[in-house]
C-alpha cells in the first residue's frame, strides 16, 4: 500500500534529486500545523507570520489585530495569553527550559484598554508557572515553589503557600517524576470552571534519593545538578491535594482533599484532577502497584468549608492482566448532569473503549465496541460526543474523528474525517471551540499535513487554515522514498510494519536493511503520518530499506498485545523485532549480510538487546541514550510495567533484563553507543554501565558522548549526532562516502 500521494513526475528525470542529510538537518521539509487559540464559541486568536496577535471571528468573517508585533518585541515576548474578560494579555519572555514540559519565564501584563503595561505590583521573576482564571482576570502563579494569587493584575499578590523549597517541597508545579511520568504537564494547579476555587498539588520530595551529575559549562569547576529522582523501588514523593477559595483566600485557607481509604493504606500516586462544577471536583488516585485506580468525586460542604468525598462516589478501575489504563489512566469527561461521565477503559474483550458511567463502574454502559480502540474523547456536548479511534479499515496506525449523537436513541455514529481527503489524510487530531460550535481538524498525513476549519453542527468545511503549499512546491523535485504499511501474522500475533523504500526500489535487487525501533509499552511507531526525516534521507539517497515494527507491548491493538510485556520488559519486544527481520529476509530483497538496528531511549534498550540476542542477524547497530537496567529508571514508569525490584516481587527479571548481562554477546556486532552527559531522564549512568561491562568483557565498541546535553540531544549536537550515525551506517553497509 503506497501511502505517499502520487505526483506528476517531470518527464526529465534529471530534474529530480534525492534528499540530502543537509535537507534534514536544516529542516528544509518541515511542515506547519494550525491550532486555533479558541477564546469563545466562534472566535480564536492566532499569531500571524509577522507576529501580530490577530482575533478571528468565524461568524462575522472579520479579523483584527489586538496586539502588535511592536508591543511583543518591546519585551521580547515569545508567547502570550489573553485574560477571559479580554482586558489584559500576559506576555512571556526569557523562556528558560527546565525538563520536558517545565520552564521558567518573565511575565509582563499588558492592559488592552489603555495600551500600556501594568505598572505597580509587577510580577517577580523568573516565574515557574502562570495562568489566568477561567473567568475574569485573576492570576495564579508559582514563584520559588510557592503559589500566589492576584485578584487583578495590578493588585498586590496573596501568598497561598509558604513551605515551598527548591528540590524539597513543590506547590502548584510537579517534581521531576510527576512531570515526566504522571501529569505530563508543567503545572499542578487547576481553577474551578468559574474561578471560585483553585486546587493544587503539594509534592514533598524530602526523602527522595537524589541523582547528581556534572554540568561542565565553561567554568573552571563543573556544576553539580541535583534532582530528587526516585528510581525503581526507591522512596517516592508524598502528594497532597488542597483547594482554596479565591474570593476569600484568607478566610479558611487551603483545605486538604481526603484520599480514598483503599488508596491511602499503602504508597500511592495522585494521577489527575478534573473540575466538574465550581463546587464539585473529581480526583484520580493510583496505588503504587499500578493496577488499581480510584476515581473520587468530591463536593464542597458550605457549612464546614471542607471537601467531602463520599465512598458512594468512588469508582474503582482495576486491571487483572496488566496495569491500569494505557500509558496513563484515562481521565473522565463529565456530562451536563455534573455526575455521570464518559471514560475510556478496557471492555470485556480487552479493547479500550468509551463507557458511560452513571452510578457504578460495574453498571457502565459501553458506548463503542469492536476489535479496535477508542483513543481520545475530545468533547461532550448536550447532543454529541466527539472522539478519535483507529477503527476505519482496520489500520491501527490511523486516527479518525467520530461523532456519536448522544441526544437521540439509539445513538448514531458518524465518521467525520474518514472520507474527507482519504489518500492524503488518515491521521487526525481536532481542536474544539466552546460548545463545539466550530472545530479545527489537523491532518498529519500520510500526505502533506493540512489544517481545516469546520462547522460543529454540520461538519462542513469552512476554510483551509494551513495547507503547506510551500512545502508541496519544495518537494516537487525531490525523489521521496516510497512508504508502505502492512502486517505480518506470526503465531497468532499481528505485527504491523512500515517499510520505507528507496525511490527506484526494485524487488529483484538486494538492499541493506535498517530497523528503527522504539517499542516501549503503549507506544506506536507504525503510524500513517507524513515525515521527511533522517530515515527518509537514508532511503532516498543511500538506498537503504528502513522498517519500523510494532510488536508486543505496543498500543491500540487490544490488551493481549499491550499487556504481553507486563513484568517481562526486554523479552517480547526484542523477539518481535527479530521475527520481523526474518520475515523481511524471506521477502527476497534484503541483503542479509547488511542488516542494522537503531533506537533512542527505550529503542536504544531494545536495539542493544537485539544486537546482543546472539542470532547473528545484525551486522551493526546504534543505541542512543538507552536504558540499560530497569533499576536505573524512574519508579513511576518502571514499576507500572515491572513491579518492584524486590526478592518477593520481580527482582529476578530486573536483573535478567539488563544490557550488561549480555555484554559477551556484543563481540560479533559493531555497536555504537551514544549518550548526553546531562541526561536528566535516562541518566548517563545507563551507558556508563554498558561501557564498563563491555570493557570488562574485553569487547570492542564505538561510543560518543555529548557534553552537557540532555535526553533530546538538541541544537548543534543533533547535526553532529546524525552525521556521526550516518558515517557509522555507511561504513557498516560498505556504502561509499
Amino acid at each position: 500500500i503506497v501511502l505517499r500521494p502520487s505526483r506528476v513526475h517531470n518527464s526529465e528525470e534529471n530534474t529530480m534529486r534525492a534528499l540530502t542529510l543537509k535537507d534534514i538537518l536544516n529542516g528544509t521539509f518541515s511542515y506547519k500545523t494550525f491550532f486555533p487559540n479558541w477564546i469563545s464559541g466562534q472566535e480564536y486568536l492566532h499569531q500571524s507570520a509577522d507576529n501580530n496577535i490577530v482575533l478571528y471571528n468565524i461568524e462575522t468573517g472579520q479579523s483584527y489585530t489586538i496586539l502588535s508585533n511592536r508591543t511583543m518585541k518591546s519585551v521580547n515576548a515569545s508567547n502570550y495569553g489573553l485574560s477571559p474578560d479580554r482586558q489584559f494579555v500576559y506576555l512571556e519572555s526569557d523562556y528558560s527550559k527546565l525538563w520536558r514540559y517545565s520552564y521558567t519565564a518573565t511575565y509582563y501584563i499588558y492592559d488592552l484598554s489603555n495600551g500600556e503595561f501594568v505598572r505597580g505590583n509587577e510580577l517577580p521573576r523568573p516565574i515557574q508557572y502562570l495562568c489566568w482564571s477561567p473567568v475574569g482576570s485573576k492570576l495564579a502563579y508559582v514563584y520559588q515553589n510557592n503559589i500566589y494569587l492576584k485578584q487583578r493584575p495590578g493588585d498586590p499578590p496573596f501568598q497561598i503557600t509558604f513551605n515551598g523549597r527548591e528540590n524539597k517541597i513543590f506547590n502548584g508545579i510537579p517534581d521531576w517524576v510527576y512531570e515526566e511520568e504522571m501529569l505530563a504537564t508543567k503545572y499542578a494547579l487547576w481553577w474551578s470552571p468559574n474561578g471560585k476555587f483553585l486546587a493544587y498539588a503539594e509534592f514533598n520530595d524530602t526523602d527522595i534519593p537524589v541523582i547528581a551529575y556534572s554540568y561542565y559549562g565553561d567554568e573552571q569547576y563543573p556544576r553539580t545538578i541535583n534532582i530528587p529522582y526516585p528510581k525503581a523501588g526507591a522512596k517516592n514523593p508524598v502528594v497532597r491535594i488542597f483547594i482554596i477559595d479565591t474570593t476569600y483566600p484568607a478566610y479558611v485557607g487551603p483545605q486538604e482533599v481526603p484520599v480514598p481509604a483503599m488508596i491511602a493504606s499503602s504508597d500511592y500516586y495522585f494521577s489527575w484532577l478534573t473540575w466538574v462544577t465550581d463546587e464539585r471536583v473529581c480526583l484520580q488516585w493510583l496505588k503504587r502497584v499500578q493496577n488499581v485506580s480510584v476515581l473520587s468525586i468530591c463536593d464542597f460542604r458550605e457549612d464546614w468549608q471542607t471537601w467531602d468525598c463520599p465512598k458512594t462516589q468512588e469508582h474503582i478501575e482495576e486491571s487483572r492482566t496488566g496495569w491500569a489504563g494505557g500509558f496513563f489512566v484515562s481521565t473522565p469527561v463529565f456530562s451536563y448532569d455534573a455526575i455521570s461521565y464518559y471514560k475510556i477503559f478496557s471492555d470485556k474483550d480487552g479493547y479500550k473503549h468509551i463507557h458511560y458511567i452513571k452510578d457504578t463502574v460495574e453498571n457502565a454502559i459501553q458506548i463503542t465496541s469492536g476489535k479496535w480502540e477508542a483513543i481520545n474523547i475530545f468533547r461532550v456536548t448536550q447532543d454529541s460526543l466527539f472522539y478519535s479511534s483507529n477503527e476505519f479499515e482496520e489500520y491501527p496506525g490511523r486516527r479518525n474523528i467520530y461523532r456519536i449523537s448522544i441526544g437521540s436513541y439509539p445513538p448514531s455514529k458518524k465518521c467525520v474525517t474518514c472520507h474527507l481527503r482519504k489518500e492524503r489524510c488518515q491521521y487526525y487530531t481536532a481542536s474544539f471551540s466552546d460548545y463545539a460550535k466550530y472545530y479545527a481538524l489537523v491532518c498529519y498525513g500520510p500526505g502533506i499535513p493540512i489544517s481545516t476549519l469546520h462547522d460543529g453542527r454540520t461538519d462542513q468545511e469552512i476554510k483551509i487554515l494551513e495547507e503547506n503549499k510551500e512545502l508541496e512546491n519544495a518537494l516537487k523535485n525531490i525523489q521521496l522514498p516510497k512508504e508502505e504499511i502492512k502486517k505480518l501474522e506470526v503465531d497468532e500475533i499481528t505485527l504491523w510494519y512500515k517499510m520505507i523504500l528507496p525511490p527506484q526500489f526494485d524487488r529483484s535487487k538486494k538492499y541493506p536493511l535498517l530497523i528503527q525501533v522504539y517499542g516501549g509499552p503503549c507506544s506506536q511507531s507504525v503510524r500513517s503520518v507524513f515525515a521527511v526525516n533522517w530515515i527518509s534521507y537514508l532511503a532516498s539517497k543511500e538506498g537503504m530499506v528502513i522498517a519500523l515494527v510494532d510488536g508486543r507491548g505496543t498500543a491500540f491493538q487490544g490488551d493481549k498485545l499491550l499487556y504481553a510485556v507486563y513484568r517481562k520488559l526486554g523479552v517480547y519486544e526484542v523477539e518481535d523485532q527479530i521475527t520481523a527481520v526474518r520475515k523481511f529476509i524471506e521477502m527476497g530483497f534484503i541483503d542479509e549480510k547488511r542488516i542494522a538496528i537503531w533506537g533512542w531511549s527505550y529503542g536504544g534498550y531494545v536495539s542493544s538487546l537485539a544486537l546482543a540476542s546472539g542470532t547473528g542477524l545484525f551486522k551493526c547497530g546504534i543505541a542512543v541514550a538507552p536504558v540499560s537496567s530497569w533499576e536505573y529508571y524512574a519508579s513511576v514508569y518502571t514499576e507500572r510495567f515491572m513491579g518492584l525490584p524486590t526478592k518477593d516481587d520481580n527482582l529476578e527479571h530486573y536483573k535478567n533484563s539488563t544490557v550488561m548481562a549480555r555484554a559477551e554477546y556484543f563481540r560479533n556486532v559493531d555497536y555504537l553507543l551514544i549518550h548526553g552527559t546531562a541526561d536528566d531522564n535516562v541518566h548517563f549512568q545507563n551507558s556508563a554501565q554498558i561501557a564498563k561491562a563491555l570493557v570488562n568483557a574485553q569487547v570492542d565498541f564505538q561510543a560518543m558522548w555529548y557534553s552537557d546535553q540532555n535526553h533530546g540531544l538538541s541544537g548543534l549536537s543533533t547535526n553532529h549526532l546524525y552525521t556521526h550515525m550516518t558515517h557509522f551506517l555507511k561504513q557498516c553497509f560498505s556504502l561509499s562516502d
Epitope: G41, Q42, E43, T60, T65, I66, R86, G115
Partner: nanobody
C-alpha cells in the same frame, strides 16, 4: 481608524441616567464582541462593560447593577444604559471591539455627572 461613532453623552445630575450609543459603520460588524471603555481626566483608560458574541455580558465592579450593555444587530449599534450615575462616572466614554482593535480609538462621548 476605527469606524465606530459614540454618542449620547452629556451633563447629568448624580442619580440620573444616560443612554450611550455606538454606531458601527463600514467593515465593523456589531456581532463581534463589543466593549465600552472610559477615561477620566488624568487617569488611564479603563474597561467598563463587554457583550460577547453570544450575548453574555460582563461589567467592571464599579458599574455592576447600574450599567447595562446591549446591542441591536439590525441597527449595527451597541448601547450602554447608565443609571444611578455618580460623579466618579465622569469620563470620556469610548466603544470598541473586545478586546479593542490595537491602537485604534474613536473620539468618544463626554459624560459629566455633577453632584
Amino acid at each position: 481608524q476605527v469606524q465606530l461613532q459614540e454618542s449620547g453623552g452629556g451633563l447629568v445630575q448624580a442619580g440620573g441616567s444616560l443612554r450611550l450609543s455606538c454606531a458601527a459603520s463600514g467593515s465593523i460588524d456589531i456581532r463581534n464582541a463589543m466593549g465600552w471603555y472610559r477615561q477620566a481626566p488624568g487617569t488611564r483608560r479603563e474597561w467598563v462593560a463587554t457583550i460577547t458574541t453570544d450575548g453574555r455580558t460582563n461589567y467592571a465592579d464599579s458599574v455592576k447593577a447600574r450599567f447595562t450593555i446591549s446591542r441591536d444587530n439590525a441597527k449595527n449599534t451597541v448601547y450602554l444604559q447608565m443609571n444611578s450615575l455618580k460623579p466618579e462616572d465622569t469620563a470620556v466614554y469610548y466603544c470598541n471591539l473586545a478586546p479593542p482593535i490595537f491602537g485604534s480609538w474613536g473620539q468618544g462621548t463626554q459624560v459629566t455627572v455633577s453632584s
